[in-house]
């Protein structure tokens, strides 16, 4: 549909508060340092013209595109090139080269301070006193930090967070009903974030046919009744929404994704008999929870797929005529059978399946040549089973801090020119697949762990991207994205790493751990875990055990002590002389 | 040696027909992909179609109905109809890389036949 | 329709220059099947590079070719007096009747 003004469509189509809502996250993605009331000024300005677009659409500069009006709005900001750099320079470009550019400086590790949580009468205080301005704030503090954040989604968090002060700012304990709520939020927000940032890397990165394949898969092991061409809709319409949304067409992407849910449940009895309730929600919750609705039951007697994929003798002239659909098709109808599976791999099988495909064909005997093609999967699938089940087995035998210690010992032997703060990020993450996935049963363990490892390694690749410093990282992340995770397992210990100085600095400690959160304490110690594998990759897991219990042992005397910090100056030392003898610095 | 020769063209009248052949000597014929490719003077090089080892044919969307491929034993053809004063050009024939299908990987390439059209 | 653009169409360089020629396609080629051919007057074209970026046998590794999904590019480091040619892209699809091939990127001696 042609709109004489896109800015008063958009308008009229979410309504005042969700375009403004949305206008703010686009901005505060782009401009990730501007002070929040510069924000908040520039979206005021966006809304009266769009109001202005509404009355009159043939009102002048109404019909200009989006990004234009965004763009140019963004580049009023006085302090650009002494704030931004380089970013500056964006806006000497044409649309659509200068969105392109701005979407090019989004930083995915911003220098921003770390958000503190004020006092519950504090937030409760701000919250009553201007709604309005702490949800603002909640929304500008979220999509400065996280510059791919689903915006749709976020509208969905701003609406608990909002819920969630409601209820508590009334309650007896404030601090015991809302603490938790806002812990769920964060947690349950960085994994959303991380999520839809793995889907942008696979749009950017891979393009749009790779994500479509993911979307082929996923969608296909969540609605295996569908039939074939309603997934590819649903796919189609799908990437359409994320596409924008990874661009920074936010508008049109919380647009399209009502109109998607709207779609679906209205459609719901040939897509899956899960979205009853769902679809019973307002529209946000509606879209959050398709998002995250249950696999359906698998149809009853589904035919052997080596009739149609391997037995058929059309099976070269349809694969070489529409590779899309053909694969497309492989695709779905395996994925459907396949629930058990995780998405990466069901990816790898049908490229091996359009490999010996693309061999065969052309052979003197195609079908012999491809007869055993399903044979070729049973290794696919049993690295991962395997993978798996030695690593959950590991995690039961350590528990989850022991385990992510295991997993940054061994990453930091893989790629140890990493950057500390990053190997403890990424390893932390790793090893909280067990503790998120080893808990289900065999059925469901592939999905959940692979998938998830999916999404922390694509962590590790877009903050190596922005300072590349391993090779090897470069290699497992560009490569193939089905194969990034087989990529880092089968990494060894990178012989060619010459070993860092040794730095008393970074193993001395102060009397300010010990006040320090559980998890706080954790990182620290986790931190100076990486740097021990930094100065000694050879040591071995003994060795590496032996100073840590010497450093918990340490901290857990020192802040026992009466005269805490000269515990910390004293003891540290001898700490320090010890773990060198005993790992021969 | 391995060799790809083309042979039968010429000078043809518009709306006539032509039979190009391509004998391939020095590897077995019925293990290969071999494709038909065209260029007109000073022009773009334009995929016209292929043969499978199987005998599987496909043609660029413009050329069917009025082109065919065929093969035998040692020799792939090309027959030409309705030709019009655009299909002059040098034709070849070339190999399929082995190992591939689809792709557009031509290992092993004729020195061409030059087609002309026109009355 | 599939749209492969070459560019420039001619390029004057000198031995030892490094040369750069590019190759967009619409829509993205399938599973990076991009290959670049040499062209000399009068003869058939010689396959260089396939899958983007591998060298066919015997080919010099001063020809490099990079890219994926839409834009490609050949390399040539140091420019040889043999490399003065036509260079073309040719890049395979979903459906193999659409395998196409870009117009060229004539190398001249300056």
């Known amino acids: 549909d042609a709109h004489k003004s896109e800015v008063a469509h958009r308008f009229k189509d979410l309504g005042e508060e969700n375009f403004k809502a949305l206008v703010l996250i686009a901005f505060a993605q782009y401009l990730q340092q501007c002070p929040f009331e510069d924000h908040v000024k520039l979206v005021n300005e966006v809304t009266e013209f769009a109001k202005t677009c509404v009355a009159d659409e043939s009102a002048e500069n109404c019909d200009k595109s989006l990004h234009t009006l965004f763009g140019d709005k963004l580049c009023t900001v006085a302090t650009l090139r002494e704030t931004y750099g380089e970013m500056a320079d964006c806006c000497a470009k044409q649309e659509p080269e200068r969105n392109e550019c701005f979407l090019q400086h989004k930083d995915d590790n911003p220098n921003l301070p770390r958000l503190v949580r004020p006092e519950v009468d504090v937030m409760c205080t701000a919250f009553h006193d201007n709604e309005e301005t702490f949800l603002k704030k909640y929304l500008y503090e979220i999509a400065r930090r996280h510059p791919y954040f689903y915006a749709p989604e976020l509208l969905f968090f701003a609406k608990r967070y909002k819920a969630a002060f409601t209820e508590c700012c009334q309650a007896a304990d404030k601090a015991a009903c809302l603490l938790p709520k806002l812990d769920e939020l964060r947690d349950e927000g960085k994994a959303s974030s991380a999520k839809q940032r793995l889907k942008c890397a696979s749009l950017q990165k891979f393009g749009e046919r790779a994500f479509k394949a993911w979307a082929v898969a996923r969608l296909s092991q969540r609605f295996p009744k569908a039939e074939f061409a309603e997934v590819s809709k649903l796919v189609t319409d799908l990437t359409k929404v994320h596409t924008e949304c990874c661009h920074g067409d936010l508008l049109e992407c919380a647009d399209d994704r009502a109109d998607l849910a709207k779609y679906i449940c209205e459609n719901q009895d040939s897509i899956s008999s899960k979205l009853k309730e769902c679809c019973e929600k307002p529209l946000l919750e509606k879209s959050h929870c398709i998002a995250e609705v249950e696999n359906d039951e698998m149809p009853a007697d589904l035919p052997s797929l080596a009739a149609d994929f391997v037995e058929s003798k059309d099976v070269c002239k349809n694969y070489a005529e529409a590779k899309d659909v053909f694969l497309g098709m492989f695709l779905y109808e395996y994925a459907r059978r396949h629930p058990d599976y995780s998405v990466v791999l069901l990816l790898r099988l049908a490229k091996t399946y359009e490999t010996t495909l693309e061999k065969c064909c052309a052979a003197a005997d195609p079908h012999e040549c491809y007869a055993k093609v399903f044979d070729e999967f049973k290794p696919l699938v049993e690295e991962p089973q395997n993978l798996i089940k030695q690593n959950c087995e590991l995690f039961e035998q350590l528990g989850e801090y022991k385990f992510q210690n295991a997993l940054l010992v061994r990453y930091t032997k893989k790629v140890p020119q990493v950057s500390t703060p990053t190997l403890v990020e990424v390893s932390r993450n790793l090893g909280k697949v067990g503790s998120k996935c080893c808990k289900h049963p065999e059925a469901k363990r592939m999905p959940c762990a692979e998938d998830y490892l999916s999404v922390v390694l694509n962590q590790l690749c877009v903050l190596h991207e922005k300072t590349p410093v391993s090779d090897r990282v470069t290699k497992c992340c560009t490569e193939s994205l089905v194969n990034r995770r087989p990529c880092f397992s089968a990494l060894e210990v990178d012989e060619t790493y010459v070993p860092k100085e040794f730095n008393a600095e970074t193993f001395t400690f102060h009397a300010d751990i010990c006040t320090l959160s559980e998890k706080e304490r954790q990182i620290k110690k986790q931190t100076a875990l990486v740097e021990l594998v930094k100065h000694k990759p050879k040591a071995t897991k003994e060795q590496l055990k032996a100073v840590m219990d010497d450093f918990a042992a340490f901290v857990e005397k020192c802040c026992k002590a009466d005269d805490k910090e000269t515990c910390f100056a004293e003891e540290g030392k001898k700490l320090v002389a010890a773990s060198q003898a005993a790992l021969g610095l | 040696e391995v060799q790809l020769l083309e042979s039968g063209g010429g000078l043809v009248q518009p709306g006539g027909s032509l039979r190009l052949s391509c004998a391939v000597s020095?590897?077995?014929?019925?293990?290969?992909?071999i494709n038909w490719v065209r260029q007109a003077p000073g022009k773009c090089l334009e995929w016209i179609g292929a043969?499978?080892?199987?005998?599987t044919t496909f043609y660029a969307t413009w050329a069917k109905g009025r082109f065919t491929i065929s093969r035998d034993s040692t020799t792939v053809y090309l027959q030409m109809n309705s030709l019009r004063a655009e299909d002059t050009a040098v034709y070849y024939c070339?190999?399929?890389?082995?190992?591939?299908?689809?792709?557009?990987?031509?290992?092993?390439w004729g020195q061409g036949t030059l087609v002309t059209v026109s009355s | 329709d599939i749209v492969m653009t070459q560019s420039p169409s001619s390029v004057s360089a000198s031995v030892g220059d490094r040369v750069t020629i590019t190759c967009q396609s619409s829509?993205?080629?399938?599973?990076?099947?991009l290959s670049w051919y040499q062209q000399k007057p009068g003869k058939a074209p010689k396959l260089l590079i396939y899958?983007?970026?591998k060298l066919t046998s015997g080919v010099p590794s001063r020809f490099k070719g990079s890219g994926s999904g839409t834009d490609f590019t050949l390399t040539i480091s140091s420019l040889q007096p043999e490399d003065f040619a036509t260079y073309y892209c040719?890049?395979?699809?979903?459906?193999?009747?659409?395998?196409?091939f870009g117009c060229g990127t004539k190398v001249e001696i300056k």
């Open positions: 070339a190999r399929t890389v082995p190992g591939y299908s689809t792709a557009p990987y031509f290992d092993l």
């Open positions: 020095g590897i077995d014929l019925s293990n290969y992909a």
């Open positions: 043969i499978w080892a199987s005998g």
């Open positions: 829509p993205s080629v399938w599973s990076n099947f």
């Open positions: 899958e983007a970026s």
């Open positions: 040719g890049g395979g699809y979903s459906s193999i009747s659409d395998t196409t």
